[in-house]
């Protein structure tokens, strides 16, 4: 089981949208995948995916989860507030047929205060 998370760094403006992506790959098929997003070590959500669907669509304050086959788990924060700033980690574990687990590298989210004199959002793209 491999987990690749991106972007490494994400800087957005307060009130806008932030998208964090977790790519989950395994050479063999799986029946149920447990996923988890944490922020600064605290669990935001811990749903599972089975039959192509997420058991939960929300993830923390203003967070929405989606699963796009074959491998992309997306956490969308909208609207972003200042307290969304932090270090996000995606973790995944195949529960069926056999326990396998892996986690991504940290995504550091920086939220700039809403200031009309600043440039528009700078959203990094997911590598690969």
């Amino acid at each position: 089981l491999s987990v690749q998370q991106g972007p490494n760094l994400l800087q957005v403006r307060q009130g806008s949208q932030a998208t964090l992506v977790c790519q989950v790959d395994q050479a063999t098929a799986w029946e149920r995948l447990r996923v988890k997003w944490t922020k600064d070590g605290a669990i935001l959500c811990q749903p599972y995916i089975t039959n192509g669907s997420l058991s939960l669509g929300v993830c923390g304050p203003q967070g929405r989860l989606s699963w796009q086959a074959p491998s992309h788990l997306t956490l969308q924060l909208d609207p972003v507030s200042l307290n969304h700033s932090g270090a996000y980690v995606c973790w995944a574990a195949v529960e069926i047929p056999e326990l396998e687990e892996a986690e991504g590298n940290i995504t550091r989210l920086f939220v700039d205060p809403d200031d009309p004199t600043q440039n528009r959002n700078r959203i990094a793209s997911f590598p690969g």
């Epitope: 491999s2 050479a27 063999t28 098929a29 799986w30 192509g52 074959p70």
Partner: antibody, heavy 120, light 113 residues
Framework: QVQLQESGPGLVKPSQTLSLTCTVS??????????WSWIRQHPGKGLEWIGY???????YYNPSLKSRVTISVDTSKNQFSLKLSSVTAADTAVYYC????????????WGQGTLVTVSS | DIVMTQSPDSLAVSLGERATINCKSS????????????LNWYQQKPGQPPKLLIY???TRLSGVPDRFSGSGSGTDFTLTISSLQAEDVADYFC?????????FGDGTRLEIK
């Protein structure tokens, strides 16, 4: 360019242990998300998956051979190895090493294969 | 274990004609989670290791001639060579990676008529 090369004795006596090594060049076997695999092919026949070892060190074996198989990795030499104990004539085959990635699920790179004959 | 059954065992086709090889699995290789079929096709020429042609049942590996195509889903799969060339003479194997143990078909020997 990734290359794999099998090495080891071509003749093994019955009841002994078959030992083969696969040397990987052009790629580090410590790279995450890869399965380092052994596959064999009996003369004139189909392919049989023996097992593989994941980057984490976790091993997966074919249940038909599990009691006799050990796959291990030597990261310092960028090699992985196969040991098959208590061999019989039925273990005579061409043995291949190959790699498989989580992002694919297919055997992308193969060694050229080495014929191992079990005979007294 | 998932049993992979290939047919025919051998096949003789004239140059420029179509060759069709079938592969049937004892259980579905389609995952509703990833929307993928866990089925690969390999070509093996004498004295050489197998070479990947098609993955996920229908995706042709980069560099593989477009006369090779894969189709099917679930339990029934087909490898088609639209116009046989002399260099296509080889053994062809299907392989499932839906679950371990990974298993291969027994192979189809393709020859020129």
């Amino acid at each position: 360019q990734v290359q794999l090369q099998e090495s080891g004795p071509g003749l093994v006596k019955p009841s002994q242990t078959l030992s083969l090594t696969c040397t990987v060049s052009g790629f580090s076997i410590t790279t995450g998300g890869y399965y380092w695999s052994w596959i064999r092919q009996h003369p004139g026949k189909g392919l049989e998956w023996i097992g593989y070892i994941y980057t984490s060190g976790r091993t997966y074996y074919n249940p038909s051979l599990k009691s006799r198989v050990t796959i291990s990795v030597d990261t310092s030499k960028n090699q992985f190895s196969l040991k098959l104990s208590s061999v019989t004539a039925a273990d005579t085959a061409v043995y291949y090493c190959a790699d498989m990635a989580d992002k694919g699920g297919w055997f992308a790179y193969w060694g050229q294969g080495t014929l191992v004959t079990v005979s007294s | 274990d998932i049993v992979m059954t290939q047919s025919p065992d051998s096949l003789a086709v004239s140059l420029g004609e179509r060759a069709t090889i079938n592969c049937k699995s004892s259980q579905s290789l389609f995952s509703s989670n990833t929307k993928r079929n866990y089925l690969n096709w390999y070509q093996q020429k004498p004295g050489q290791p197998p070479k990947l042609l098609i993955y996920h049942a229908s995706t042709r590996l980069s560099g593989v001639p477009d006369r090779f195509s894969g189709s099917g889903s679930g339990t029934d799969f087909t490898l088609t060579i639209s116009s046989l060339q002399a260099e296509d003479v080889a053994d062809y194997f299907c392989q499932q990676h839906y679950e371990t143990p990974l298993t291969f078909g027994d192979g189809t020997r393709l020859e020129i008529k």
